[in-house]
Interface confidence: low
């Protein structure tokens, strides 16, 4: 049904009125305002911005806007003892040192408080030793090194290129391989697009540019000292030795000028194949250690960063629903940045600001949404999704009972080629229907719908005539809502035509060069892509908060469950003999998926026919839709990952950014041929099939007629 049918909606106050109020010029103005100084989590500057946003959201017309503060573990370089990496000769003299900071971009030379590049939460240490080049430091890269090349990383300092997977996974892999330090660098192969100039003349990474970022392995825990509970005034904090997810070896990031100096001397083994070579003029030798002439030289890291409990501030705005005020649709994105945040996060925060302004304008004219809309400006996302997770921990009982949907709003752009959407299958139809109603901003698609340009540029690999929609992974603030609480979630942004580099980010990601000018000059001068993203995010929120029947289609879940069951069965069938030996059957899972499909189909039929004027029945049907995502939550969580509780989706154990389907079964099967106790390993596969089958069946039954 259209939003016009919602209670208290006059024809003027429909989706079109909301969308028409969104203006590209305002987004531009807000982006400029949010990016003039750094807004690092835990700093005075970011607190001031929180208060500014609180004040402006109140002016825009929200019913209430509050700050929610928490005292969480953050990490900063030591001001008087900078971090760097050296090459030392046999006498211990430093013959080369990496840069201490990025050369500031034009116009920003006199800006204070630019945090130098560092790996947040690195322990202190000054390890020295031989270097081993480990490609992207993925699981498969260490398999290649250790199993095929027989190279031992124990006691070595490893150097890994950024890209492909979350940096925290790289560090975890290096630790497990026995490394005593990690150097992360940006290779031009991954962060320098051919034919484009370096910033400030283009959007490519200059040689002195460096990607900052946290290197935690939190697995959804939030604040490392208070897992599961909010870091409030009376919190009990773990000792640092018991903190969740902290790395145990020093880690530091560098740019490709400095990387060249380290890699050009590498000796030892040649790279195993061309996939290990980047674009620098170096041999990409794996090591260990330097080549003949330089064999007595070592690498030394100097890391002096400190972990400190620091206050952070979320801004939480409320627009009360007129009919179902106890049902919450949440739009959230973070405010903290590594430096200026030109793309991450302020291109997203500016869009949220304009969405709030548009909703506020409608509210001032007497309109209210059917359901309550919560707007959030999260703090400390860059330090491990801390602000959103702490708030969700504090409000978990309300959220699990009242949370309808969460729409994420980090960076609005990572390119300007086409739309990119990751969401729960429940939202597929909502996204399809909405994008068919929006104009495409793309050149060559004038007068065409966003759906049309998106489908043309990013087609679904399975269904012709439909666009690709990806699984939710993690690495952003939807994590706690979706993976822990089971609240239907989605995200949308404009992206690049660069599928192979999906998880590497744009070239200037987390560098000092991520400025307002980067966006205004090179990515979106007319702010038309930002406006489109505002329409998609805002339109989703509008429909979720305002449609009489929730715009969720449970049949789409049935389709993907079958696809995921087929996929995991295929993986298992690579071991037919073991499946026979240990009596491994997927029958229960396929049976549960079949039941889900049938029940979902019947539910959808009832959804078309029921009496929508009966508020009790309407509420009952909507609750079944709202609680369907919740039904996929296992209260015990995944093995060794208690805060990843969604049985259908979890962040990949090998790459936090990527989503994995049936993650419990997938992880049980992963590298199973190398397990020392096959009987135990295949027993765990069987247990995970049981958990998945039970969960799918239980979820299906929530859609059955209630009595």
């Amino acid at each position: 049904k259209s939003s016009n049918e919602a209670t208290n909606i006059t024809p003027k106050h429909n989706m079109k009125a909301f969308l028409d109020e969104l203006k590209a010029e305002n987004i531009k103005k807000f982006l400029y305002n949010f990016t003039q100084i750094p807004h690092l989590a835990g700093t005075e500057q970011n607190f001031q911005l929180a208060k500014q946003i609180q004040s402006q959201w109140k002016e825009f017309g929200l019913d209430s806007v509050e700050l929610a503060h928490y005292d969480v573990l953050l990490s900063y370089p030591n001001k008087t003892h900078p971090n760097y990496i050296s090459i030392i000769n046999e006498d211990g003299n430093e013959i080369f040192n990496t840069s201490l900071f990025e050369p500031p971009p034009p116009g920003y030379e006199n800006v204070s408080d630019i945090v130098p590049p560092f790996s947040a939460f690195s322990p202190q240490g000054m390890p020295e030793g031989d270097l081993v080049y480990v490609n992207y430091a993925r699981t498969e890269d260490f398999f290649k090194l250790e199993r095929d090349m027989k190279i031992n990383c124990s006691g070595k300092i490893v150097i890994a290129r950024y890209g492909k997977v979350f940096r925290g996974n790289k560090v975890k892999n290096a630790q497990l391989a026995g490394a005593k330090g990690v150097i992360l660098y940006s290779d031009p192969a991954d962060y320098f697009a051919p034919g484009v100039k370096s910033y400030p003349d283009g959007w490519n990474l200059p040689g002195g540019g460096v990607q900052r970022g946290n290197i935690l392995n939190l697995n959804g825990a939030g604040d490392p000292l208070t897992p599961g509970y909010p870091a409030n005034e009376y919190a009990y904090r773990r000792g640092i030795a018991e903190a969740v997810g902290l790395p145990s070896i020093p880690v530091h990031p560098i740019g490709y000028y400095d990387a060249q100096k380290l890699l050009e001397k590498m000796g030892g083994s040649a790279p195993p194949d061309s996939s290990w070579r980047g674009s620098l003029k170096v041999p990409y030798n794996v090591g260990p250690g330097f080549t003949g002439n330089f064999s007595t030289q070592k690498v030394k890291m100097h890391i002096h960063s400190t972990n400190e409990v620091t206050r952070i501030y979320n801004v939480i705005g409320t627009l009360r629903g007129a009919v179902e005020p106890d049902r919450y649709v949440i739009l959230g994105g973070h405010r903290d940045s590594w430096v200026f945040g030109g793309i991450d996060p302020q291109s997203g925060a500016a869009v949220v600001h304009e969405i709030v302004r548009s909703f506020g304008t409608l509210k001032k004219e007497g309109w209210r949404p059917r359901r309550t809309i919560l707007f959030a400006s999260w703090d400390a996302e860059e330090f491990g999704l801390l602000g959103s997770t702490e708030w969700a921990e504090e409000n978990s009982r309300l959220l699990q009972e009242r949370g309808v949907a969460y729409i994420n709003a980090d960076s609005s752009i990572e390119g300007n080629y086409t739309l990119r959407v990751d969401c729960t299958p429940l939202m597929y139809s909502l996204v399809h229907n909405l994008t068919k109603e929006l104009k495409s901003p793309d050149e060559g698609f004038e007068g065409k719908s966003l759906y049309e340009s998106w489908t043309k540029k990013s087609p679904s690999p399975e269904f012709s005539g439909m666009p690709r929609i990806s699984k939710l992974g993690s690495g952003n603030d939807f994590e706690v809502f979706f993976q822990r609480l089971g609240i239907a979630s989605g995200r949308a942004r404009y992206t690049k035509n660069w599928e192979t580099n999906k998880f590497s980010g744009y070239p200037l990601y987390h560098s000092v060069y991520e400025t307002y000018e980067l966006v205004e000059k090179f990515y979106d001068p007319m702010f038309k892509y930002h406006l489109t993203v505002a329409q998609v995010r805002g339109g989703m929120v509008f429909e979720l908060a305002n449609s009489i029947v929730l715009p969720f289609d449970c049949r789409d879940y049935a389709v993907v469950l079958r696809k995921y069951a087929d996929k995991i069965y295929s993986i298992s069938m690579k071991h037919p003999q073991e499946m026979k030996t240990y009596s491994v059957s997927f029958d229960s899972l396929f049976s549960a998926v079949k039941n889900f499909t049938e029940i979902a189909s019947k539910f959808s039929e009832r959804l078309q026919d029921f009496d929508k004027s009966n508020p009790i029945v309407l509420r009952m049907m909507n609750d079944q839709l709202m609680f369907l995502e919740r039904a996929f939550i296992d209260p015990l969580g995944l093995p060794d990952r208690p805060f990843y509780r969604h049985v259908i989706y979890a962040p990949s154990s090998h790459n936090k950014y990527a989503g994995e389907s049936f993650p419990g079964i997938y992880d049980a099967l992963f590298d199973i041929e190398s397990k020392v106790d096959p009987s135990k390993a295949w027993g765990e596969v069987k247990r995970q099939i049981y958990v998945a089958a039970f969960t799918v069946q239980a979820a299906a039954e929530t859609l059955s007629e209630v009595a």
Epitope: L40, G42, T43, E44, Q45, Y76, P77, N78, K79, T80, P82, L100, F101, P104, E109, N110, V111, S112, D113, I114, V115, P116, F118, T306, E308
Partner: nanobody
Framework: EVQLVESGGGSVQPGGSLRLSCAAS????????MTWVRQVPGKGLEWVAN????????YYVDSVKGRFTISRDNAKNSLYLQMNSLRAEDTAVYYC?????????????????GGQGTTVTVSS
């Protein structure tokens, strides 16, 4: 306006000594940490040493420890770097810089580098 003028550079043989000076004006010198950085042509800036407002804390990059000494005279608005046992790898343009404290004192901030620098060449 912040002004920083470096002097005292020159050519010297390995093992020799030089004393660099920096005359500061345009700001309250005694309110700021001060820093020496250096740049080898074609390479990035390298932090060398820094000194607290009252001179009570000094920090050095490992490669110069025991050879270089940073000092200051707040009465004269001057910063110094005594460089002993010079090596070829110390060859660089040396700049003095005002460490911009800002609101957060937890990390190494950007620095105001107003001067043209003074060149130190160490070769036999």
């Amino acid at each position: 306006e912040v002004q920083l003028v470096e002097s005292g550079g020159g050519s010297v043989q390995p093992g020799g000594s030089l004393r660099l000076s920096c005359a500061a004006s345009g700001f309250t010198f005694s309110d700021y940490w001060m820093t020496w950085v250096r740049q080898v042509p074609g390479k990035g800036l390298e932090w060398v040493a820094n000194i607290k407002q009252d001179g009570s804390e000094k920090y050095y990059v490992d490669s110069v420890k025991g050879r270089f000494t940073i000092s200051r005279d707040n009465a004269k608005n001057s910063l110094y770097l005594q460089m002993n046992s010079l090596r070829a790898e110390d060859t660089a343009v040396y700049y003095c810089a005002r460490d911009r404290g800002g609101a957060v004192a937890l990390y190494h901030n950007g620095m105001d580098m107003g001067g043209q620098g003074t060149t130190v060449t160490v070769s036999s």
